[in-house]
């Protein structure tokens, strides 16, 4: 069989949720391998995922160093086998990714309702503060630690017996809402960063309803 040319990567795409960040690209390699490099605008190009036949590279460890920085990645195509390099002067082909700013662009993961507690006609709903892979002083920060007051949660709640939804908002991880005595309610929450222009909202959490295990009911 004759030689083929190395081909440049294309469709470079950032996939990121709660700062877990993977660069994906095409095509599946034939007689070639890839090495990824990542850099900030002012930094060095650091090689990662050396000589791989994968079409993805986990860059989480790099972007969590400073989630407010803007990153650029590039994917090099290296001949491996019966191929010819099509780069000029022996230079390998590469393709640049779009820029990526984790703080502004990482998707907000689906939140989880940690608990709810009814005391009379008040219900306290608590959203789990999910751990991220962002570190400070060797400990992993939560989503709230990273985003602070930029992150709000919207609570959707409704009587089990009806479909009319009400909403509440909080810039903490807790809601305190008024309910009708003797009624069971269902809850769902959504994470939101209002200041963003893209990826502003998470998907809704799984629905939790009173009268099930998660909650606690106290008649005062």
């Amino acid at each position: 069989s004759g030689t083929t040319n190395t081909v440049a990567a294309y469709n470079l795409t950032w996939k990121s949720t709660n700062f877990k960040t993977i660069l994906e690209w095409e095509p599946k390699p034939v007689n070639q391998v890839y090495t990824v490099q990542i850099s900030t605008k002012s930094g060095d190009w650091k090689s990662k995922c050396f000589y791989t036949t994968d079409t993805e590279c986990d860059l989480t460890d790099e972007i969590v160093k400073d989630v407010k920085q803007t990153y650029l990645a590039r994917v090099f195509s290296y001949p491996a086998g019966n191929v010819e390099s099509t780069g000029s002067a022996g230079e390998p082909l590469y393709e640049n990714s779009p820029e990526f700013t984790p703080y502004l662009e990482t998707n907000l993961g689906q939140p989880t309702i940690q608990s709810f507690e009814q005391v009379g006609t008040k219900v306290n709903v608590t959203v789990e503060d999910e751990r991220t892979l962002v570190r400070r002083n060797n400990t992993f920060l939560s989503l709230r630690d990273v985003f602070g007051k930029d992150l709000i949660y919207t609570l959707y709640y409704w009587k089990s017996s009806s479909s009319g939804k009400k909403t509440a908002k909080t810039n903490t991880n807790e809601f305190l809402i008024d309910v009708d005595k003797g009624e069971n309610y269902c809850f769902s929450v959504q994470a939101v960063i209002p200041s963003r222009t893209v990826n502003r909202k998470s998907t809704d959490s799984p629905v939790e309803c009173m009268g099930q295990e998660k909650g606690e009911f106290r008649e005062i």
Epitope: V33, G43, D44, W45, K46, F76, Y78, A80, G90
Partner: antibody, heavy 117, light 106 residues
């Protein structure tokens, strides 16, 4: 011109500590991973690991994890390989080599380490 | 770890002979390099990415293979080719070298 210049030959006793160096010049030292390779007398090459000078991230061959430590001093463009307690079995030639693709290939001249009582 | 087994470990050949060195990997490898080392010298990259000749390497050298079996071939051995040749895989960490093949003059 890219150059990697390693420190001179060392003769040590078992149990002693040692730090050998590899100074890079003619390129952006912080931009390239630096490999370390061991060659015991009359034997083949063994990849020990590598370090990225900009942030000191290391990828270490687990075979060497309790034996040697990689470090860098960015301010003087120098990579180091060190031992806290040498053994006779550490007697070898040690090479540093810049991690490069393809025909680019830069190795230090090697440092001979002899450990003998 | 991926083990690389080179064979033969040494060979004696004459100038003009065709020489083949094999490197067998314990699991599949997608990126293989070959190095040449002469006594008292640092190794030099000789073939990279399975079949690409490094700069200045004569065309009598060639590399081939895939999966677990790789070869370095010298079509017509020359005096300057007498050296030790090592394969190295860079497909998975830790990167590993073969044990080497010493090519000697018959």
């Amino acid at each position: 011109e890219v150059q990697l210049v390693q420190s001179g030959a060392e003769v040590k006793k078992p149990g002693e500590s040692l730090k050998i160096s590899c100074k890079g010049s003619g390129y952006s030292f912080t931009s390239y991973w630096m490999n370390w390779v061991r060659q015991m007398p009359g034997k083949g090459l063994e990849w020990m690991g590598m370090i990225y000078p900009a942030d000191s991230e290391t990828r270490l061959n687990q075979k060497f994890k309790d034996q040697a430590t990689l470090s860098v001093d960015k301010s003087i463009s120098t990579a180091y390989l060190q031992w806290s307690s040498l053994k006779a079995s550490d007697t070898a030639m040690y090479y540093c080599a810049r991690e490069d693709y393809g025909s680019s290939d830069y190795w230090g001249q090697g440092t001979t380490v002899t450990v003998s009582s | 770890d991926i083990q690389l087994t080179q064979s033969p470990s040494s060979l004696s050949a004459s100038v003009g002979d065709r020489v083949t060195i094999t490197c067998s990997a314990s699991s599949s490898v997608s990126y293989m390099n070959w190095y040449q080392q002469k006594p008292g010298k640092s190794p030099k990259i000789w073939i990279y990415g399975i079949s690409n000749l490094a700069s200045g390497v004569p065309s009598r050298f060639s590399g081939s293979g895939s999966g677990t079996d790789f070869t370095l071939t010298i079509s017509s051995l020359q005096p300057e080719d007498f050296a030790t040749y090592y394969c190295q895989q860079k497909s998975s960490f830790p990167w590993t070298f073969g044990g080497g093949t010493k090519v000697e003059i018959k």
